[in-house]
């Protein structure tokens, strides 16, 4: 949905959320291009790209929340994700540098689509909260009330370490979106009925 416009159709909105989370759990859209661009696409280096425990809520945690709490948690987490993606983007090579080093410009374009995609998802989360008459949700363009600040990566001059931290974050993000998709797939066909 375009920012600020909300569908009144529950099943269409849920379908959009399901579609967005389906696409955002796909590592070929974010993690894989990041690994290639950052020169981590070597078996020994890939082994170091593991999800940091506790960086994202677990599927079990998400399943334990009601619809309202789930949407609030998702909204807050997506706020943190936006901060981290902005940070990652600042450290990406420029298009001309990519071409010189023979890397794929499409990978950079995929990475640059990540934030608009998250904003689109966040808008639909806000719309769903409105549809479920959830007055506690804040506008999608603002930080959520009580939203924890994004975890600040440990200051380090080690460029390689920063690349690995970005890689771990993205792996966790894809896993989180997979969990979110599984929760949405269990939502019922009407806004006032949940099958958990």
């Amino acid at each position: 949905a375009a920012m600020g416009s909300c569908s009144k159709e529950y099943r269409m909105l849920l379908g959009q959320l399901q579609k967005q989370t389906d696409l955002m759990q796909d590592t070929s859209r974010l993690l894989d291009p990041y690994i290639r661009i950052q020169g981590l696409d070597i078996p020994k280096l890939r082994e170091h790209c593991r999800e940091s425990p506790g960086a994202f809520p677990s599927e079990e945690t998400l399943r334990g929340l009601g619809r309202r709490g789930f949407l609030q948690t998702l909204n807050a987490t997506l706020g943190r994700v936006l901060h981290r993606l902005a940070d990652l983007e600042q450290h990406l090579p420029k298009a001309q540098d990519l071409e010189r080093s023979g890397l794929n410009i499409e990978d950079l374009e995929k990475l640059q689509m990540a934030r608009p995609n998250v904003l689109g998802l966040r808008n639909n989360v806000y719309c769903m909260a409105q549809l479920l008459d959830n007055s506690d949700m804040t506008e999608p363009t603002k930080a959520g009330r009580g939203t924890p600040q994004p975890p600040t990566p440990t200051p380090t001059s080690d460029v390689f370490q920063r690349k690995l931290e970005g890689c771990s974050f993205l792996r966790g993000y894809h896993r989180f979106m997979h969990s979110v998709g599984r929760v949405f797939s269990k939502w019922g066909e009407s806004p006032n009925r949940s099958r958990r």
Epitope: L14, G15, E189
Partner: antibody, heavy 120, light 106 residues
């Protein structure tokens, strides 16, 4: 393999009713949403209605008062009851399947269609 | 409802050429879907989620775009590609189709 076969079309007078059927095979209607989409002769495609795996329905507002979508899970068959038919309802009516169990409003498998002609 | 406008209405090309079909929405949409329809046949899904090839679709087909403007490209036309192509959205209710672009042999 996954297949949809429509039937029930034909020539009908304005104001009369008709019921279309769509027999599904290779998948269960309890797992997927299935839609009706129509195409007037020489024209484009127009979404009519959907029935989701749990039985909930959604309609194009243009047809909501006259058309009813339903299904019989035991027969794995979809229906479209069309009342108060008009000449402008003349079209090929296709049933089409959503690609997975989510609420996806696009279509990965289509039937061959059944022609409805409304004429006096 | 969102109105999708396809251009051109008819495109005349020869086999081996590149076809570029456009679809413009009256409002922004999240994803676009493309179908191919041959005379007397049902439509067939070609592209889902703007740029993903549907199952069994050859790689000469590709999709791109965002917001209100989307494109279907057929890179190296084969004789069997001459047909009518429709775009479709479901970002806004109800789902709607474009009026179609007829791709004919020059």
């Amino acid at each position: 393999q996954v297949q949809l076969v429509e039937s029930g079309g034909g020539v009908v007078q304005p104001g009369r009713s008709l019921r279309l059927s769509c027999a599904a095979s290779g998948f269960s209607l309890t797992n997927y949403g299935v839609h009706w989409v129509r195409q007037a002769p020489g024209k484009g495609l127009e979404w009519v209605a959907v029935i989701w795996r749990g039985g909930s329905t959604d309609y194009n507002a243009a047809f909501m008062s006259r058309f009813t979508i339903s299904k019989d899970n035991s027969k794995n068959t979809l229906y479209l009851q069309m009342n108060s038919l008009r000449a402008e309802d003349t079209a090929v009516y296709y049933c089409a399947k959503s690609p997975n169990s989510n609420f996806y409003w696009y279509f990965d498998v289509w039937g061959r269609g059944t022609l409805v002609t409304v004429s006096s | 409802e969102i109105v999708l406008t396809q251009s051109p209405a008819t495109l005349s090309l020869s086999p081996g050429e590149r076809a570029t079909l456009s679809c413009s929405g009256s409002s922004s949409v999240s994803y676009m879907y493309w179908y191919q329809q041959k005379p007397g046949q049902a439509p067939r899904l070609l592209i889902e989620d703007t740029s993903n090839l549907a199952s069994g679709i050859p790689a000469r087909f590709s999709g791109s775009g965002s917001g209100t403007d989307y494109t279907l490209t057929i890179s190296n036309l084969e004789p069997e590609d001459f047909a009518v192509y429709y775009c479709q959205q479901w970002s806004s209710y109800p789902p709607t189709f474009g009026q179609g672009t007829k791709l004919e042999i020059k």
